[in-house]
């Protein structure tokens, strides 16, 4: 639960955050797990700890291993683990899978590629961007803050993108690179006023008391990747997170699907252990984008369990 994988290349800077989060005032001690040796805090060391951060300036293959961070409040010590792997630099252009960060998708309307992990570093713009090891040049490519914007995206823009930047630590500069794949959805997109496919307006959903129930809010917003679109549930006009009922939760994240070429989003509302009082609540499926907001209301009714006779 409190273990995190991190990776980097030899002779580059690598900064790792302790997976165990605490309040800002808490101190953090780092140890190399295999030897239980404390990581120094003095910045003159190549590897040193700085609060929640562990810094390799620069990293070496021999640094690979599991590092323990202990977050200390005045009365409690809690432990996290960082599994660090430092790889040798590749002589050829191919970036192996184990060095790749999560893939991102884009389209003509939305082509941002964020540079992974950059928020951990002390860097200054501009970033350098490479595609398949070639420096990106031309007016279609714009390095903006911590991301790359590609104008007029085409299918040929798919590939592996590497961001390169300089981390500065007390006047010394260290190179950092990070690579992720970019895929392109090749479509001419447009945006519509949201259309809610489910639930139907004023739908009554039958549920069994004591059982779990799922409600799906599904809406379509147009064709292609949508710049601003969201579906969510409200209870009695209140956001789920503010309602404060831990049994009723929205599914983490929104599922994106393309139905008949349309861009649609789903949000599942999960009700654990349905109670009588749940039947009194108003469940609103909300779909919104730049055109506006549409709302469909659902209510729950008791479903009488069917008697089974042998």
């Amino acid at each position: 639960k409190f273990s995190k994988q991190s990776w980097g290349l030899e002779n580059e800077a690598l900064i790792v955050r302790c997976p165990r989060q605490g309040k800002p005032s808490y101190t953090v001690d780092w140890y190399y797990s295999q030897t239980n040796k404390s990581i120094p805090t003095q910045e003159r060391n190549r590897v040193f700890a700085s609060g929640q951060l562990l810094k390799f300036l620069p990293a070496a293959v021999a640094d690979s291993g599991i590092y323990t961070c202990i977050v200390r409040s005045p009365t409690f010590n809690r432990t996290g683990y960082a599994n660090v792997t430092i790889y040798k630099k590749q002589s050829d252009c191919n970036v192996p899978d184990y060095l790749m960060y999560s893939t991102v998708s884009g389209s003509e309307k939305n082509s941002k590629i964020y540079c992974p992990t950059i928020d951990l570093y002390n860097w200054t713009a501009p970033l350098e961007w490479f595609k398949n090891c070639q420096a990106l040049q031309g007016s279609r490519y714009r390095a903006h803050k911590s991301f790359l914007v590609i104008d007029n995206v085409m299918t040929e823009d798919a590939g592996d993108y590497t961001c390169k930047f300089i981390h500065n630590e007390n006047g010394a500069n260290y190179s950092v690179t990070a690579t992720r794949s970019f895929t392109v959805k090749d479509e001419q997109g447009f945006s519509l006023f949201p259309v809610i496919g489910a639930p139907a307006q004023n739908e009554i959903k039958e549920v069994e008391i004591g059982k779990n129930a799922n409600l799906t809010c599904s809406a379509c917003f147009g064709k292609g990747t949508q710049f601003l679109a969201a579906v969510l549930w409200q209870l009695n006009g209140t956001k789920i997170t503010d309602f404060g009922e831990p049994r009723i939760q929205q599914e983490e994240g929104q599922n994106q699907s393309f139905s008949n070429g349309l861009a649609c989003l789903d949000m599942v509302l999960r009700i654990a252990d349905v109670k009588e009082e749940d039947l009194l609540l108003q469940y609103d499926c909300l779909a919104l984008n730049l055109h506006g907001l549409r709302r469909h209301t659902v209510r729950l009714s008791r479903k009488n369990p069917i008697d089974h006779h042998s």
């Epitope: 639960k1 309040k23 409040s73 409690f76 503010d242």
Partner: antibody, heavy 123, light 107 residues
Framework: EVQLLESGGGLVQPGGSLRLSCAAS????????MIWVRQAPGKGLEWVSS????????YYADSVKGRFTISRDNSKNTLYLQMNSLRAEDTAVYYC????????????????WGQGTLVTVSS | EIVLTQSPATLSLSPGERATLSCRAS??????LAWYQQKPGQAPRLLIY???NRATGIPARFSGSGSGTDFTLTISSLEPEDFAVYYC?????????FGQGTKVEIK
């Protein structure tokens, strides 16, 4: 020294209301999540409600949802529990307690507890 | 909600003996489990957090172990002041839940 002092308990008829208070001292009250836990006579511990620090998000046990309201006044270092529509089964010692760690979306243990205040619901 | 089941309900032992208390969760709580001690007329006192870490000021004779669904509180050698009721509590998710308690009494 961290101290939590509950007050406001007493005898109330079924259907009645009470407001419990918990005065906190010895720590920066506003940054800590606070919790109410109750214990019926001769029974075990039951979590009642939690409130986040400055964010103020609230959580309730099913048994009190819609009847009890947790709140806090950070300027007065005080935690409250407004109890309405009281029932005989709400009879218990009510403790306020501190969660010393929790970050957004997480919970932790209860490291400091008050001495408790007895609420008796009876006609 | 996550149900915590403690066993045994009562443990009758003599001072100096070893006490082993069990707490089983209905689903995994990772290591998000605590143990409390409660004496009559007093508020609970935190003993163990994160399944195995002793809280500040807790004697070394108290130790916790386990992860996932099965947890144990061990008192290596009972002192007279250790006779009390012990509760486990999970904090991986709301609602926070407690076990029903194990009473450690003098034999």
């Amino acid at each position: 020294e961290v101290q939590l002092l509950e007050s406001g308990g007493g005898l109330v008829q079924p259907g009645g209301s009470l407001r419990l208070s918990c005065a906190a001292s010895g720590f920066t009250f506003s940054i800590y999540d606070m919790i109410w836990v109750r214990q019926a006579p001769g029974k075990g511990l039951e979590w009642v409600s939690s409130i986040r620090g400055e964010g103020g998000g609230t959580y309730y046990a099913d048994s009190v949802k819609g009847r009890f309201t947790i709140s806090r006044d950070n300027s007065k270092n005080t935690l409250y529990l407004q109890m309405n529509s009281l029932r005989a089964e709400d009879t218990a010692v009510y403790y306020c307690a501190r969660d010393p760690w929790s970050t957004e979306g997480s919970f932790f243990v209860l490291d400091y507890w008050g001495q408790g205040t007895l609420v008796t619901v009876s006609s | 909600e996550i149900v915590l089941t403690q066993s045994p309900a009562t443990l009758s032992l003599s001072p100096g003996e070893r006490a082993t208390l069990s707490c089983r969760a209905s689903q995994s709580v990772d290591d998000d489990l605590a143990w409390y001690q409660q004496k009559p007329g007093q508020a609970p006192r935190l003993l163990i957090y994160d399944a195995s870490n002793r809280a500040t000021g807790i004697p070394a004779r108290f130790s916790g172990s386990g992860s996932g669904t099965d947890f144990t509180l061990t008192i290596s050698s009972l002192e007279p002041e250790d006779f009390a009721v012990y509760y486990c509590q999970q904090y991986i998710t709301a609602p926070l839940t407690f076990g029903q308690g194990t009473k450690v009494e003098i034999k």
